[in-house]
């Protein structure tokens, strides 16, 4: 009997060497970066993260297929030491790295793991697919990957608590977009009960025009959104923290002179 | 089943005060922006104010309603209140409670029947 | 504030036909714009939101469409019960939230 064949998709397949990367960085993740988690058994994550997709069809992935690897992944993050990312993401990693005590999402075990990496599997095999997996212009917005990363960002932001910051993009028209991850599912998953404050850090492209974004209608937009659940809001045009870091890759613009 | 029930209305002259009341039952009360909704007789619809989820620690009024209507949300009672002071004529209309969907949007999916309130000399 | 404006103000159709209702609204509101039904004595009832999202409940025959500034809500067609006054409302730039003027669709 020959094999079935796979299913042929449009976007880019497994990446390769997927396991191999996956335990890689979970090792280097639970025993050394976060050692109080070396207890973790990073085989186990393995096979209970592949479980929720292998041999399934990629389109059909449901919340609950990854329900078995958010139960096995717990992870305390302290309060006050969340920090969500909407299309500011390689400035928001560079800030935690540097800061060392906030976590964005790809600063937790999963997400650290998972960043940039692409799976898929295929109804006729246990492996993973290797030649193609869904992209996101196919009508298949329940895929693996998709799936995963609301999973977890809708758990992130669940158990955030006390004070908590999210990263925005001020270069954008819309640096609060509705349709983000962090616009669609983690500001709703807030757990108003727990957390009693979001301030947004709205960030300027240092060669951008600089404008007063925390006045715009986007980020009134967020103001509302925050307020009707019943939490506080601040926003901070060009965190000052985070500018500095701006200006390491510029620093002769005049925004990083420091007023001696 | 999901449900919205006022009370209070009534006939007042101008000038003067009611409390309206909203009972809800069937849904999580504490969980819903709430709002009231008005329509006066033979007329459209107008948004009057809003309150935040849990505690209500945010409100909302429309400018005709600024500094003399105040909404307030009691959650061990499941109810939502309209407190209406220096009423005037203009202010005569049906007045609904309304849930607001608990999602990314905000359109009204529960209304209670309305309560009537009269304002006239 | 955004202002809604909803045409016809009366449509005099037959049941059987297809009702077409407009809404337009002052300036950009994205997707976020409600269809509200009224009838008589009753309280407004939710059918479709986020402009084409159709509430709990509510039978297919009732659709909505458009973005940005124009809109419209149609009913495939007209059952005796759809016979009703229908508002417009937009939850994009509030407050205040605002509605439309109303649509009566009567029997012809």
């Known amino acids: 009997l020959r094999p079935r064949s796979l299913l042929v998709w449009t976007g880019e397949p497994t990446t390769k060497h997927f396991s191999d990367i996956f335990l890689g960085r979970c090792l280097i993740y639970t025993q050394i970066l976060r050692p109080e988690m070396r207890d973790q058994n990073c085989q186990e994550i393995l096979s209970t993260f592949k479980g929720a997709f292998v041999s399934k069809n990629p389109c059909n992935i449901t919340r609950e297929d990854y329900a078995p690897l958010v139960k096995l992944v717990t992870q305390t993050i302290p309060c006050n030491k969340t920090l969500f990312w909407s299309k500011s993401k390689h400035l928001a990693h560079q800030y935690t790295w540097i800061q060392g005590k906030m976590f964005t999402l790809e600063d937790t075990l999963l997400g650290y793991i998972a960043d940039d990496l692409r799976w898929c599997g295929d109804p006729s095999t246990s492996d993973m697919n290797y030649v193609s997996c869904p992209h996101w212009s196919e009508n298949c917005p329940n895929n693996p990957i998709t799936v995963f990363w609301k999973v977890i960002s809708q758990k992130f932001a669940e158990d955030a608590c006390g004070v908590v910051q999210v990263m925005l993009n001020g270069s954008l028209r819309e640096p609060f977009y509705k349709n983000s991850t962090f616009g669609s599912v983690e500001v709703f998953s807030l757990d108003p009960n727990k957390v009693h404050k979001l301030q947004a850090w709205v960030m300027h492209d240092i060669e951008g025009a600089s404008s007063n974004a925390c006045s715009s209608s986007s980020l009134n937009e967020l103001k509302m959104i925050v307020q009707k659940r019943n939490m506080i809001f601040a926003c901070v045009d060009n965190y000052r923290p985070a500018r500095f870091l701006q200006c390491v890759k510029n620093p002769e613009h005049p925004s990083c002179r420091l007023n001696t | 089943e999901v449900q919205l029930l006022e009370s209070g209305g009534g006939f007042v002259q101008p000038g003067g005060s009611l409390r309206l009341s909203c009972a809800a039952s069937g849904f999580t009360f504490t969980n819903y922006v709430m709002n009231w909704v008005r329509q006066a007789p033979g007329k459209g619809l107008e948004w009057v104010s809003s309150?935040?989820?849990?505690?209500?620690?945010?409100?909302w009024y429309a400018d005709s309603v600024k500094g003399r209507f105040t909404i307030s949300r009691d959650n061990s009672r499941n109810t939502l209140y309209l407190q209406m002071n220096s009423l005037r004529a203009e202010d005569t209309a049906i007045y609904y409670c309304a849930r607001e969907m608990n999602t990314y949007s905000f359109p009204m999916d529960v209304w209670g029947q309305g309560t009537t309130v009269t304002v006239s000399s | 504030e955004i202002v809604l404006t909803q045409s016809p103000g009366t449509l005099s159709l037959s049941p059987g036909e297809r009702a077409t209702l407009n809404c337009r609204a002052s300036q950009n509101v994205r997707s976020d714009l409600a269809w509200y039904q009224q009838k008589p004595g009753q309280a407004p009832r939710l059918l479709i939101y986020d402009a084409s999202n159709r509430a709990t409940g509510i039978p297919d025959r009732f659709s909505g469409s458009g973005s940005g500034t124009d809109f419209s809500l149609t009913i495939s067609r007209l059952e005796p019960e759809d016979f009703a006054v229908y508002y417009c409302?937009?939850?994009?730039?509030?407050?205040?939230?605002?509605f439309g003027g109303g649509t009566k669709v009567e029997i012809k």
């Open positions: 309150i935040s989820i849990s505690g209500g620690r945010y409100t």
């Open positions: 409302q937009q939850y994009y730039d509030w407050p205040p939230y605002t």
